[in-house]
Each structure stands twice: as C-alpha cells, then as structure tokens.
C-alpha cells in the first residue's frame, strides 16, 4: 500500500495505525495516500518539523496516549486537508504559537488530558473553521480574553477538569454557534453576570463539581435553547427567584450535592420540557405547595438524602406525568392523605429510610399504576386495610426493617402479604418487632394466635385478595425496578464520559435501571 512502515498496520481504506512502546519517532515512510493516521501508546516524546509532509491528503490524525511533551511549531505543516486532530492523553505543557497555522480545514481539535498550563489568543487564531475544541483534563488556571474570539463556528467546547478559579464575562462572547460548553470539575466560585449572554444556541452547559456559591439572577436569561444544565456538586445555598425563568427548552436539570435549604416559589418555571430534576444531597427541609407546578412534563424527581420533614398536600401539584419520585433518606414522619393525589402516572416511589409511623389509607388512591414502593427502614407498625388493593401493577414492595406490631390487628396485612409474597422480594422479609415473644419472626408466617391479642379484632380479617399473577413481570433483585446499585449522578450524555462514576452505595437514590444508565 505505497509503503507501510513495519511498526504500523495499513488498511485498504487508507487508514494507518502505529502502536507500541518500541516506536520512539513518527514512523517513515508513511503511505502518501493515507487519509487517517493513528499513533497510539508509543514512546514518542517530541514531534519535529514536518514529519507528515508527504501525506497531505490526511483528514484525521490521532496522536494519543504517548509520551509527547514537545512539538515544533511546524510539525503539522502541509496538512491543509486535516479535519480532525487529536493530541489527547500526552504530556504537553506548552503549545507553540502557530502550531495550527495552515490547518484551514480543521474542525475538531482534541488537546484533552495533557498538562497545559495556559492558552493564548494566538494559539487558535488561525482555526476559523473549528467546530470542536477539547481542552479538558489540563492544568489551565485562567482563560485570557480573546482566547476563542476567532472560533466563531465552534459548536463544542470542553474546559472541564482544569484549575479555573474564575471566568471573564467576555471570554465566550463571540461563540454564537456554541451548542455544548463544559466547565465541570474546576474551582469556579462564581460566574459573572453576562458570561453566557452571547451563547444564544447553547444546548448543554456543564458546571458541576465546582465551588459555585451564588448564581446571578440573569445568568441564563439569553440561553433560550438550553436543554441540559448541570449544576450539581457545588456550594449553591439559594437560587435567585428568576434564575431559571427563560429556559423553555430545558429537559434536564441537576442540582444535587449543593446546600439548598429551600426552594423559592416559582423557581422552576415555566419549563414545559423538563423531564428530570435532580435535587438529592441538599438541605431541603420542607416542600411547599406548587413548588414544581410548572413542570408539566417532569418524569423523574429525585429529592432523596435531604432533611425533608414536611410536605405540603399540594407540593406535587402539576406533576401529572411524573413516573419516578424519590423521597428516601429524609426526615418524614407524616404524609397528608392528599399528598400524592395528583401523581396519576407515578410508577416508582421510594420512601425508605424515613421516620414514617403510619400511612394514610388512601395515600396511593389515585396512583393506580404504581409498580414499585420502597417503604423499608421506617417506623411502621401496621398499614391501613386495603392500602395496596387497587395497585394491580405492583410488582415490588419493600417493607422490611420496620417495627411491625404482630398482634391480631396485623392479620389483614399478613394475609395480603401471604397472597402477594413474590412482590416482597427474596432478599429481606418483614419481621415482627413486637410483642417480645414473636420478635424477629417473619410477619408472613407468624402465628398471630401466639401474639398478644389486640384491643379490637377486625371483623373481616383479610385484605381484599389481590392475587399474584405469574405473568406480571417479576424483577429479580439485581435488576429490580428500584435497584439500589446505581450511579451517583445522572448519565450526562458525555462523549468523553469524564464524570460518570458507578457506586455500590445502597443508599443513593432508589431509581430504575433505565434511569441509572
């Protein structure tokens, strides 16, 4: 194929791949008709003048995962057709000025996972056709004004995983075509008003894992096309009332891992397209009426691991499309009988790890499609007669780790559980806590006659019997509807997958496999 170096493999499709620790310089001669060249996992430490001079048809060049620490300014001379250049995962600390000069066709430039200490306006001033610039995983401490001024066609810019402590409000002002801006995992403490005003086409803004304490009220007011906004794992203690007001296209908002104590009235809206709202790991103590009422399309609401002790009966007004509601690991002792009445499409609810002593008999009255209810680790001693009767789709019910009182009042519940045992799962069954002579015995098989009789015995000692139908889908514990082995954060659709972490923490947020990626 017009000469293929021995250290490389060359395919008919003009693709050349050179890999291996024995390679210490760019192999020669490279086939003149090469259109794609990959130099991966080598011991190349520097690129000298014009090593690619004879392969001017090259469209894609990947020099990744090498020991590369120095590049001569003319290294990419004569590559006028190059559209894709990746220098990711090397050891570059400095980029020579003029390095990308002459790369008039360049659309994607990947400089991620190096040790770059700074960038200058002159670095990218020739890259007027650039659409994607990846700078994440470097050591950048600031971005000078003008750094991106010539990149008017840029649609994706990743500055995540650097050491940025502040951003100038002018640095992005000319990026009117930008669709994705990632600033996650930096050290930003605040973002000046106007920083994102020029980004009228922005669809994704990733600001998670910084140290942001305050958001300017009008910070996102010009970003009408924003669809995904990631603000998780910051230090945000309050949200200005109008901060999310101009975001009609938003469909995912993550605010978990902040210091929010309350949700100001009208804060979420109008957001007619929001599908997911992640608020776990905050300090929220109560939910007033109508706090989510503008979120008519919301399907996933995660409020776990807060300090919620009171939910107003109209807190979930408007959430007619909600499928998943996570309230576990809070301080709930009481629930008003009307609190879930509006959630007609709810499928999964997690209420585990609270202090619930009893449930209203009609708590699930309007929620006929419930498939999974997590009630483990509360203070429940009994449940009202018929509380689950109308829930024909219920296939997962967790009741263990409650102090069940196994007197004769428990008979109706015991009889229903006996008929619906598969719904309880096989891992842990509910056991009696009192009276003392039956403590630790399974609630399902307990002989209630042995227990101390209650003051009054129900006349009809059984729940109306909803049998377990074998054709109802049953979920083994490892892939259950509310599997507790999940991601600590929602999947953020990153091509570079820099922030996704899997955990085995059994107390994260009680959601479906589908939602946990």
């Amino acid at each position: 194929y017009h000469g293929c170096p021995s250290e490389c493999t060359c395919s008919r499709a003009s693709q050349v791949e050179c890999t291996g620790a024995r390679i210490v310089a760019v192999p020669t001669p490279l086939p003149w008709n090469a259109m794609s060249l990959q130099i991966l996992n080598t011991h190349i430490t520097e690129l000298n003048e014009s090593p690619f001079l004879n392969i001017s048809a090259l469209i894609a060049l990947r020099i990744e995962k090498n020991e590369l620490s120095r590049i001569t300014p003319g290294a990419f001379r004569n590559l006028g057709s190059l559209r894709y250049l990746s220098l990711a995962n090397n050891k570059l600390q400095v980029l020579p000025i003029g390095l990308f000069q002459g790369l008039d066709s360049l659309e994607s430039l990947l400089l991620s996972s190096n040790q770059l200490l700074q960038i200058q306006p002159a670095h990218f001033s020739q890259c007027s056709n650039l659409k994607e610039l990846q700078l994440h995983g470097n050591h950048l401490e600031y971005i000078p004004d003008g750094a991106f001024d010539h990149l008017v066609g840029l649609t994706k810019l990743n500055l995540g995983k650097n050491s940025l402590t502040h951003i100038s409000p002018r640095v992005f002002q000319h990026l009117g075509n930008l669709q994705v801006l990632r600033l996650y995992e930096n050290r930003l403490t605040d973002i000046p008003m106007g920083t994102f005003d020029g980004l009228v086409n922005l669809q994704e803004l990733a600001l998670q894992q910084n140290q942001i304490g305050l958001l300017s009220p009008g910070l996102f007011h010009n970003n009408h096309n924003l669809q995904r906004l990631y603000l998780s794992n910051n230090h945000i203690s309050q949200l200005p009332p109008s901060v999310f007001m101009q975001l009609p296209q938003l469909n995912r908002l993550t605010l978990f891992g902040n210091s929010l104590k309350e949700l100001s009235p009208g804060i979420f809206g109008p957001m007619p397209n929001l599908r997911e709202l992640w608020l776990y790991d905050n300090h929220i103590s109560s939910l007033p009426d109508n706090v989510f009422s503008n979120l008519r399309q919301l399907q996933v609401l995660i409020l776990s691991r807060n300090q919620i002790s009171f939910i107003s009966p109209g807190a979930f007004n408007g959430l007619t499309e909600l499928r998943e509601l996570s309230l576990h690991t809070n301080a709930l002792q009481d629930l008003d009988g009307n609190v879930f009445r509006m959630l007609a499409n709810l499928q999964n609810i997690s209420l585990q790890n609270n202090r619930l002593r009893q449930l209203p008999g009609n708590i699930f009255a309007n929620v006929n499609g419930l498939m999974a209810i997590q009630l483990q680790n509360n203070q429940l001693e009994n449940l009202p007669l018929g509380i689950f009767d109308h829930l024909g789709k219920l296939c997962e019910l967790r009741l263990y780790d409650n102090p069940w009182r196994c007197d004769s009042d428990i008979l109706p519940l015991r009889n229903w559980l006996l008929l619906n045992q598969p719904r309880l799962g096989t891992d842990t069954v509910p056991v009696c806590f009192s009276p003392a002579n039956v403590r630790g015995q399974s609630l399902i098989i307990i002989n209630v006659n042995v227990a101390v009789p209650s003051v009054h015995v129900p006349e009809v000692p059984s729940y109306p019997e909803t049998p377990w139908y074998p054709d109802t889908p049953s979920y083994p514990d490892t892939t259950s509807v509310s599997s507790t082995t999940e991601l600590t954060s929602p999947v953020e659709d990153y091509t570079d997958l820099t922030t996704i972490q899997v955990t085995d923490d059994r107390s994260v947020w009680g959601m479906t496999q589908a939602q946990s990626g």
Epitope: S264, P265, S286, P288, D289, G314, N338
Partner: antibody, heavy 118, light 107 residues
Framework: QVQLQQSGPELVRPGASVKISCKAS????????INWVKQRPGQGLEWIGW????????KYNEKFKGKATLTVDTSSSTAYMQFSSLTSEDSAVYFC???????????WGQGTLVTVSS | DIVMTQSQKFMSTSVGDRVSVTCKAS??????VAWYQQKPGQSPKALIY???YRSSGVPDRFTGSGSGTDFTLTISNVQSEDLAEYFC?????????FGGGTKLEIK
C-alpha cells in the same frame, strides 16, 4: 362529607386555661392535618399551628409556642387546643380547619368564642 | 414572617359593579395565596386557591390573579350576597399569614 364540629363558647378568668375541642367526621381523622386559627374582633386571622392526628406531631407559629398546646384523641376523632395563662389578648374566636388538596383551609369548624374576663 | 397587606380596609360598591380587592406580600410567595370570604357570624369560606383557581361551588364572577408579591381578587357583577369581609392568605412558608381583611359594603 367532611365536617368539623367545635365545642361551645367559654368564659374564663385571666390566668386560667381553656381546652376547646373539634370533632371530625366524614373522613379518616388520622390521615389529614388539623390546623387552628385565631380571630380577634377587627384584627384579622392568625394561624396558630397544626397537628397530624396519626402521629401527634405538631408545628406551632412561634408566637403561640408555650401558649397553645395541640392534642388529639384518635378514638373519638377529636382534636383539642389548650390555651394557658389566659389574658384579655386571648379573647377571640378560635377555628379548627382542615386542608384539602393544598395547604389552604378548605374545611372549617364553626368557631369557638373564648372570652377572658374577671 | 411574611406580611400580607390589604391596603383597603373598606370598599364600597353597587350591585352589578366590578370590584378588585388587592393584597401585597412582603416577599415572594409564588402562587401560594388563597382568598377567603367571611360573612358576619360565620366561618371563612375558601374562594380562590393557588392565586387563581376557584374552589368548587364558587361562582365564576370571583376570579383571582397575581403571583410573586401582588395578588388581586376581582368580583365582577357584584351581588348583594357578596357583602362580606375578604381575606388573603399565604401558605408558602411557615407561619402561614393572613391579610388584615377588606370589608365590602353594598351601596
């Protein structure tokens, strides 16, 4: 239908206590919060606090902490409010009220007039 | 505490007229405002909740509007039975608070 029936008027001496009742019917008493509201002549309405009958948990307006005590008797579906160390400022009509589908007062008792006078 | 101010203590109107009762909150309460009607010697009756939603059985001549801090109860085509005192209430944060009331008089 939901009904809240309050006890009759009370005439009490300054420094004494009074306990007024609110009997609920037409719904499951333990499943819904009961609120208490004070109305002094010509002085509008003041929220005193709520109690959740199923657990006995309470929340008070700071202004009434130590003055009002909310309790329930679930066996008779009755909520009680005790007012202590009465002064003329406590002369008012007291209402019990229940929320509906939000934290506004959909159902009201007829009110109990408390007059503090020597 | 959030202060709910009903600036007009009394309003005078005639049968068939349109009248607007206003209420101002000292801080943002979203739409968590209710309006009550209280006739002499009776308990209050909820007319409007969530700022603009009519309670069941309330005639459609009663309408509510507003959000944030400014709220209005409008009675169009006033009837003689509308002679009463009208209170606004915020239920966004504890302690829940009421306005001082506006008495509607029919000329």
């Amino acid at each position: 239908q939901v009904q809240l029936q309050q006890s009759g008027p009370e005439l009490v001496r300054p420094g004494a206590s009074v306990k007024i009742s609110c009997k609920a019917s037409g719904y499951t008493f333990t499943d819904y919060y009961i609120n208490w509201v004070k109305q002094r002549p010509g002085q509008g309405l003041e929220w005193i606090g709520w109690i959740y009958p199923g657990s006995g948990n309470t929340k008070y307006n700071e202004k009434f902490k130590g003055k009002a005590t909310l309790t329930v008797d679930t066996s008779s579906s009755t909520a009680y409010m005790q007012f202590s160390s009465l002064t003329s400022e406590d002369s008012a009509v007291y209402f019990c009220a229940r929320w509906g589908y939000g934290a506004y007062f959909t159902y009201w008792g007829q009110g109990t007039l408390v007059t503090v006078s020597s | 505490d959030i202060v709910m101010t009903q600036s007009q203590k009394f309003m005078s109107t005639s049968v068939g007229d349109r009248v607007s009762v206003t209420c101002k909150a000292s801080q943002n309460v979203g739409i968590n405002v209710a309006w009550y009607q209280q006739k002499p010697g009776q308990s209050p009756k909820a007319l409007i909740y969530s700022a603009s939603y009519r309670s069941s059985g309330v005639p459609d001549r009663f309408t509510g509007s507003g959000s944030g801090t400014d709220f209005t109860l409008t009675i169009s085509n006033v009837q003689s039975e509308d002679l009463a005192e009208y209170f606004c209430q915020q239920y966004n944060s504890f302690p829940y608070t009421f306005g001082g009331g506006t008495k509607l008089e029919i000329k």
